[in-house]
């Protein structure tokens, strides 16, 4: 009675192919003959699953990175089968938006390239989709802006699809730096004020970074000795009547408002004295 280890041991995947991430995978450890009889089985990678009985291994919720598995049938000796590749298919992983250019801050007018990166995908054939606020922008791995404007600012996402599924990046915020624009002078309580009261002129603007320096000018283009966003005239005099404009400066540049006219009218007392 010649004793020998199990012969022609094979690891067999019972599932229909392809296997997808998350599937339950059943493998059996088969052999041709053995003397004495097989009493136990071993599996590699070791300890990854509970010890299976009857030469059948069930992997619940198989991971994308479960690559190869091998079994051994054991009597007094263990005979190892050649490893089998699970070849688990999965949706693209680790999708992210990466800015290629410019290197740092995006300034108005810059040409800008965003890249949709992912670490791996199986199968490898993928499609890309770019969206902003739910609107489809493109189907390439790169999203390019020839000349970016402040209106392009917002939240962008890219999606990478393969036959298994699709994966979205985290939303990526595109911010554009630009000089002050859309400046206007607003007047409170209004553009017609009675002498002796107070009038407040406010320089309103849209800028990124915010305006850090304001300059006020009168109808003669004379700069006034005020450098804050609000110009308060109190008490206001008839001589203050005229057109005013403001200039806003941030670290990108300057912007100026159109003229706004303030009319200061005489009070009843002044008219009565005349």
């Amino acid at each position: 009675d010649v004793q020998y280890p199990p012969k022609k041991v094979t690891t067999v995947i019972q599932n229909p192919m392809p296997i997808r991430e998350g599937d339950t995978v059943t493998l059996s450890c088969n052999y041709n003959s053995s003397n004495p009889s097989v009493t136990r089985y071993e599996w590699k990678p070791h300890g990854a699953w509970e010890e299976p009985s009857l030469g059948v291994l069930k992997i619940q919720n198989v991971g994308w990175d479960n690559t190869t598995i091998a079994c051994a049938a054991c009597n007094s000796w263990c005979s190892w089968a050649s490893p089998v590749a699970l070849n688990v298919q999965y949706a693209p992983r680790d999708v992210r938006v990466r800015k290629i250019k410019p290197l740092s801050e995006i300034h108005s007018g810059n040409s800008v390239s965003l890249q949709c990166d992912f670490s791996s995908s199986h199968p490898k054939e993928v499609q890309f989709f770019w969206e902003k606020n739910g609107r489809l922008l493109g189907k390439e791995s790169q999203l390019n802006f020839d000349s970016i404007s402040p209106e392009d600012a917002g939240s962008y996402s890219c999606w990478v699809n393969n036959s298994i599924g699709q994966t979205a990046s985290k939303a990526w915020t595109l911010e554009v730096l630009y000089a002050p624009r859309r400046l206007r002078v607003s007047m409170s309580p209004g553009d017609q004020v009675m002498e002796g009261k107070s009038a407040t002129l406010t320089c309103e603007s849209d800028a990124n970074p915010p305006v850090s320096h304001y300059t006020w000018f009168d109808w003669n283009n004379q700069s006034l000795p005020y450098h804050s966003q609000k110009l308060r005239l109190e008490p206001v005099k008839v001589q203050h009547s005229g057109a005013y404009w403001c200039q806003g400066t941030n670290s990108v540049g300057k912007g100026r408002s159109p003229l706004s006219t303030l009319t200061v009218y005489y009070s009843p007392e002044t008219i009565g004295r005349r």
Epitope: S104, S108, G109, N250, S251, V252
Partner: antibody, heavy 113, light 107 residues
């Protein structure tokens, strides 16, 4: 890839003017700003001004009366002109994209009689 | 103009050491701050912008933090090639201003 190269006179007498050219390759000056920064020998960096893609400029207030920046998009060149030079304008002058994404190697200016 | 006070002005550190350089702005600059590295005889190189965003290709041992007026650059484990002078640049308020620099040398 993006490259910048400054070229200047090297030595200039006090009260004279300085002209430096920055030649840019690898991107369009229609789309990017070019800043000028200087560094006196053994000292730190000082931002001088910038010209943007649309041609608008922004100058350091301390130099606004002496400094002008212009460009020729077709030649991919940016020009710095600094008037009424003093000895403390002696420095290495750099051009850079936007606010420092890419830098030239610098050109050294000595103001001396 | 905004004054950027950078400290220390120079420091000696050992390889593998954690190094922190700080910049304090004379007023709030809203995180509009970059860090540059300059090696002797070379032009500056940008490392970080908007206080904490690492430039692509810059080693992950560099990190930036801060807000308001106070900012810092940290090198988690110093390497030989990190020797040089480091500058902060504020671009939140016109005109742009640099810190005076921190010279980092090997102990």
């Amino acid at each position: 890839q993006v490259q910048l190269k400054e070229s200047g006179p090297g030595l200039v007498a006090p009260s004279q003017s300085l002209s430096i050219t920055c030649t840019v390759s690898g991107l369009s000056l229609n789309n990017y700003g070019v800043s000028w920064v200087r560094q006196p020998p053994g000292k730190g960096l000082e931002w001088l001004g910038v010209i943007w893609g649309d041609g608008s400029t922004n100058y350091h207030s301390a130099l606004i009366s002496r400094l002008s920046i212009s460009k020729d998009n077709s030649k991919s060149q940016v020009f710095l002109k600094l008037n009424s030079l003093h000895t403390d304008d002696t420095a290495t002058y750099y051009c850079a994209i936007n606010w420092g994404d890419y830098w030239g190697q610098g050109t050294t200016l000595i103001v001396s009689s | 103009d905004i004054k950027m006070t950078q400290s220390p002005s120079s420091m000696n550190a050992s390889l593998g050491e954690r190094v922190t350089i700080t910049c304090k702005a004379s007023q709030d600059i809203n995180s509009y701050l970059s860090w540059f590295q300059q090696k002797p005889g070379k032009s500056p190189k940008i490392l970080i912008y908007r206080a904490n965003r690492l430039i692509d290709g810059v080693p992950s041992r560099f990190s930036g933090s801060g807000s308001g007026q106070d900012y810092s650059l940290t090198i988690s484990s110093l390497e030989y090639e990190d020797m040089g002078i480091y500058y902060c640049l504020q671009y939140g308020v016109f005109p742009l201003t640099f810190g005076a620099g921190t010279k980092l040398e090997l102990k």
